[in-house]
Interface confidence: low
């Protein structure tokens, strides 16, 4: 007999859940020498503990510290790339340049990237058939905890000069409910971050406007500037040319036209 | 930790061409630029291209524009380098080399190397 | 292109004395130089890159300073082992180039 389930407004969780989260960590830390030690297994088991038989609008970034602590991982300074509703072409440039991270390039990032989980009150299983909305239901839900958590880490540990990519297209290019704007603004050390390089992604073919002027760009550079870090703000009007300059700089239309620099 | 891992010697006679294979194994292949250097004998070290395999986006230095051709085969981690109309002063070691890079423009240095192939061109 | 220029050509110096090699480009190449070692009949081995940082496994003796045209690598205290050619690699602008490289024998 089929026990009764709470019905929540968002997706269930991922079909195959456990068996794509142990996949992808056996296969990143194949691919990452660095991560050679992480015990895959052990990841799962923190993974599965921070949400199983716990409420599912009830979580919190302790429910997460195991994970976070096996999870342990340090990019180098000035490799850092954040970014805002633009997460395709942020980790189409990383594929690039593959010396640039994004969160979903770091291990706990990838593990979780696109993925939907959740269990319920006092049972051991995954609910497949619907998890909270973030809107409709609940905030403190397994997947917004998580990403708030690893958001909040990848930010503190973040040094050097930082990278935000940021969609010119929308009406908020900057949008302080974002994640980066919620949460990894905030979590940038001053004393270890010297300066946030906003990247303004256009959208248009013929949009030559600069929108490093924007009044959400020049919010984003009042809350970074309070906090003692510089600001620099970069137009990146043809993301397709850009990308194509990435992956062949030596093309001479490459040498100016796909981005213009504003210093503040 | 990844090995690059090259073809044995050849030798070629002079106008013909020559291909040299470089076999990733032990890690990621695909994302990386596999560069190709060569060096003559009792000589310093030349760039001559490059690949991206992910992106199949290859590059030559404009010396050996038209004569060289680099490809990659994603499926066996092998990456290629041909060289055509060979002569006498193509006479070297030639090496396969894992880029790592810089953002933005793709600057890089190269981190692990292939042990080397000699193709002598003599008649 | 760039031009890369080594010196000395060759260095003569006694095991456990300090050896200081130079590099200098034709134009600015920013931090964006690698040093290279090489011994007889094996493949370069990447000691230093962005100028100053020591790649992985390298001891400490071998470290790089400078940026824009001059650089220098230094090895603090001659080990046997280290004995070889060394060469310096600018990838700031197309095509990357080696300098023609220093010969660091035994004095």
């Known amino acids: 007999v089929p026990r009764w389930r709470q019905q929540w407004s968002g997706s269930g969780t991922t079909s195959r859940f456990p068996e794509t989260v142990l996949a992808r960590c056996v296969k990143y830390t194949e691919v990452h020498p660095e991560m050679r030690h992480v015990d895959c297994q052990s990841v799962w088991d923190a993974f599965k503990g921070a949400f199983i038989s716990k409420y599912p609008c009830n979580i919190t970034e302790e429910d997460y510290q195991p994970l976070v602590k096996l999870g342990t991982q340090t990019v180098p300074c000035n490799k850092t790339l954040l970014w805002s509703r633009i997460k395709d072409l942020a980790h189409q440039f990383t594929q690039v340049q593959r010396d640039m991270f994004t969160l979903e390039d770091m291990l706990l990032g990838y593990l979780a990237d696109d993925l939907t989980w959740c269990g319920e009150f006092n049972t051991f299983e995954i609910n497949y058939q619907s998890c909270p909305d973030w809107r409709k239901d609940c905030s403190n839900n397994p997947v917004s905890v998580f990403w708030k958590t690893v958001s909040r880490r990848f930010a503190e540990t973040a040094c050097g000069v930082v990278h935000v990519m940021l969609n010119g297209s929308r009406s908020k290019i900057f949008d302080k409910n974002s994640t980066f704007g919620s949460v990894e603004v905030h979590n940038l050390q001053p004393e270890k971050v010297q300066a946030l390089e906003a990247w303004v992604i256009h959208g248009g073919r013929e949009d030559s406007r600069d929108l490093c002027q924007d009044p959400t760009i020049k919010e984003l550079e009042s809350i970074i500037s309070k906090r003692n870090i510089r600001f620099f703000c970069k137009n990146i009007y043809r993301p397709d040319k850009f990308l194509q300059c990435v992956k062949n700089p030596e093309d001479s239309s490459c040498l100016s036209g796909i981005h213009h620099h504003h210093h503040h | 930790q990844v090995q690059l891992v090259q073809s044995g010697a050849e030798v070629k006679k002079p106008g013909s061409s020559v291909k040299v294979s470089c076999k990733a194994s032990?890690?990621?292949?695909?994302?990386?630029?596999i560069g190709w250097v060569r060096q003559a004998p009792g000589q310093g070290l030349e760039w001559m291209g490059r690949?991206?395999?992910?992106?199949?986006?290859?590059h030559y230095a404009q010396k050996f524009q038209g004569r060289v051709t680099i490809t990659a085969d994603e499926s066996t981690s092998t990456a290629y380098m041909e060289l055509s109309s060979l002569r006498s002063e193509d006479t070297a070691v030639y090496y396969c080399?894992?880029?790592?890079?810089?953002?933005?423009?793709?600057?890089?240095?190269?981190?692990?190397w292939g042990q080397g192939t000699l193709v002598t061109v003599s008649s | 292109e760039i031009v890369m220029t080594q010196s000395p050509a060759t260095l003569s110096v006694s095991p456990g004395e300090r050896a200081t090699l130079s590099c200098r480009a034709s134009?600015?190449?920013?931090?964006?130089l690698a040093w290279y070692q090489q011994k007889p009949g094996q493949a370069p081995r990447l000691l230093i890159y962005?100028?100053?940082t020591r790649a992985t496994g390298i001891p400490a003796r071998f470290s790089g300073s400078g940026s824009g045209t001059e650089f220098t690598l230094t090895i603090s205290s001659l080990q046997s082992e280290d004995f070889a050619v060394y060469y310096c690699?600018?990838?700031?602008?197309?095509?990357?180039?080696f300098g023609q490289g220093t010969k660091v024998e035994i004095k």
């Open positions: 690699q600018q990838y700031n602008n197309w095509p990357w180039t």
């Open positions: 134009q600015s190449v920013s931090s964006n």
């Open positions: 032990g890690g990621s292949f695909s994302n990386y630029a």
């Open positions: 080399a894992r880029g790592l890079g810089y953002y933005l423009y793709s600057s890089y240095y190269f981190d692990i």
């Open positions: 690949i991206i395999p992910v992106l199949d986006a290859a």
């Open positions: 962005g100028a100053s």
